[in-house]
């Protein structure tokens, strides 16, 4: 968890405000979920470790036509604005497991809340 600020060029982890805003957006998504999120679309599971923001973006970007997560995609892009190199990209995904977007969002939310509680944003 030492380079959450950007996989392409390891830097500081996201500031508390950016992390808090992302958490709030994910909370909104989970609370406002009436029908299956993104029609039950499946995405690749990711390693919730270094490079997590880039990995989450790469996974969620494959969901098309789902306005509910577009703001999340753009906010994740804030942490990972430039594409990671091909070599780095290969290590971002757990390419053997697909889960529903709703579960992906819940898992990501739990992990980000944990980081926030532990003060891992300085």
């Amino acid at each position: 968890l030492t380079c959450l600020g950007g996989f392409a060029s390891p830097g500081p982890v996201p500031p508390s405000t950016a992390l808090r805003e992302l958490i709030e957006e994910l909370v909104n998504i989970t609370q406002n979920q009436k029908a299956p999120l993104c029609n039950g679309s499946m995405v690749w599971s990711i390693n919730l470790t270094a490079g997590m923001y880039c990995a989450a973006l790469e996974s969620l970007i494959n969901v098309s036509g789902c306005s509910a997560i577009e703001k999340t995609q753009r906010m994740l892009s804030g942490f990972c604005p430039h594409k990671v190199s091909a070599g780095q990209f290969s290590s971002l995904h757990v390419r053997d497991t697909k889960i529903e977007v709703a579960q992906f969002v819940k898992d990501l939310l739990l992990h980000l809340k944990k980081l926030f509680r532990e003060g891992q944003f300085n």
Partner: antibody, heavy 118, light 111 residues
Framework: EVKLVESGGDLVKPGGSLKLSCAAS????????MSWVRQSPDKRLEWVAS???????YYPDSVKGRFTISRDNARNILYLQMTSLRSEDTAMYYC????????????WGQGTLVTVSA | DTVLTQSPASLAVSLGQRATISCKAS??????????MHWYQQKPGQSPKLLIY???NLESGIPARFSGSGSRTDFTLTINPVEADDVATYYC?????????FGGGTKLEIK
């Protein structure tokens, strides 16, 4: 409404320095990456610098080591410190919100003019 | 660097007709099933405005007269039908490879 207002452009001599500012409003500034893009007198656009919400910075080789992008999330201001300026740095400098490589630059300021001339 | 070549440099189209602008990249700008190519409109005296992201996605608030297509190295921006308000210079931009680069622009005029 998203608003980006650049300032600090001026006439400067080759080898000189200048610091540009961009005041942002209408969105949660700290949550988004930001960039500077310039447009030369011949109207060509060139990406100059980007900074992530986690303060990771990115530059093209043409400005690396001379320009520094930074941000003040408490004041919602983006900066571009330019040193060792050359005549080819003469351009309109735009501040833009960067929604990442998948979404491009959805919001741009009106620009501030930098002229490098003896 | 990925060089983007736009053609034509300028074109004149009658109101209500179709305008087609091409952007060719020196190498593929595709990544994980997406084409990292975006299109901008710049009216005289104004800053650029995002029209299309990822080759074919219409940015919020942009009229459906604008559309984008293409993949790998060949991309097209289409305006159909052209309106008087579309007089501007159009730029393509790639974000697949650092440094991010722009095309030289295509100036659209009304015939």
């Amino acid at each position: 409404e998203v608003k980006l207002v650049e300032s600090g452009g001026d006439l400067v001599k080759p080898g000189g320095s200048l610091k540009l500012s961009c005041a942002a409003s209408g969105f949660t500034f700290s949550s988004y990456a930001m960039s500077w893009v310039r447009q030369s007198p011949d109207k060509r656009l060139e990406w100059v610098a980007s900074i992530s919400s986690g303060d990771t910075t990115y530059y093209p080789d043409s400005v690396k080591g001379r320009f520094t992008i930074s941000r003040d999330n408490a004041r919602n201001i983006l900066y571009l410190q330019m040193t060792s300026l050359r005549s080819e740095d003469t351009a309109m400098y735009y501040c833009a919100r960067l929604d990442g490589y998948y979404f491009g630059f959805p919001y741009w300021g009106q620009g501030t003019l930098v002229t490098v001339s003896a | 660097d990925t060089v983007l070549t736009q053609s034509p440099a300028s074109l004149a189209v009658s109101l209500g007709q179709r305008a087609t602008i091409s952007c060719k990249a020196s190498e593929s700008v595709d990544h994980s099933g997406s084409s990292l190519m975006h299109w901008y409109q710049q009216k005289p005296g104004q800053s650029p405005k995002l029209l299309i992201y990822r080759a074919s996605n219409l940015e919020s608030g942009i009229p459906a007269r604008f559309s984008g297509s293409g993949s790998r190295t060949d991309f097209t921006l289409t305006i159909n039908p052209v309106e008087a308000d579309d007089v501007a210079t159009y730029y393509c931009q790639q974000s697949n490879e650092d440094p991010w680069t722009f095309g030289g622009g295509t100036k659209l005029e009304i015939k």
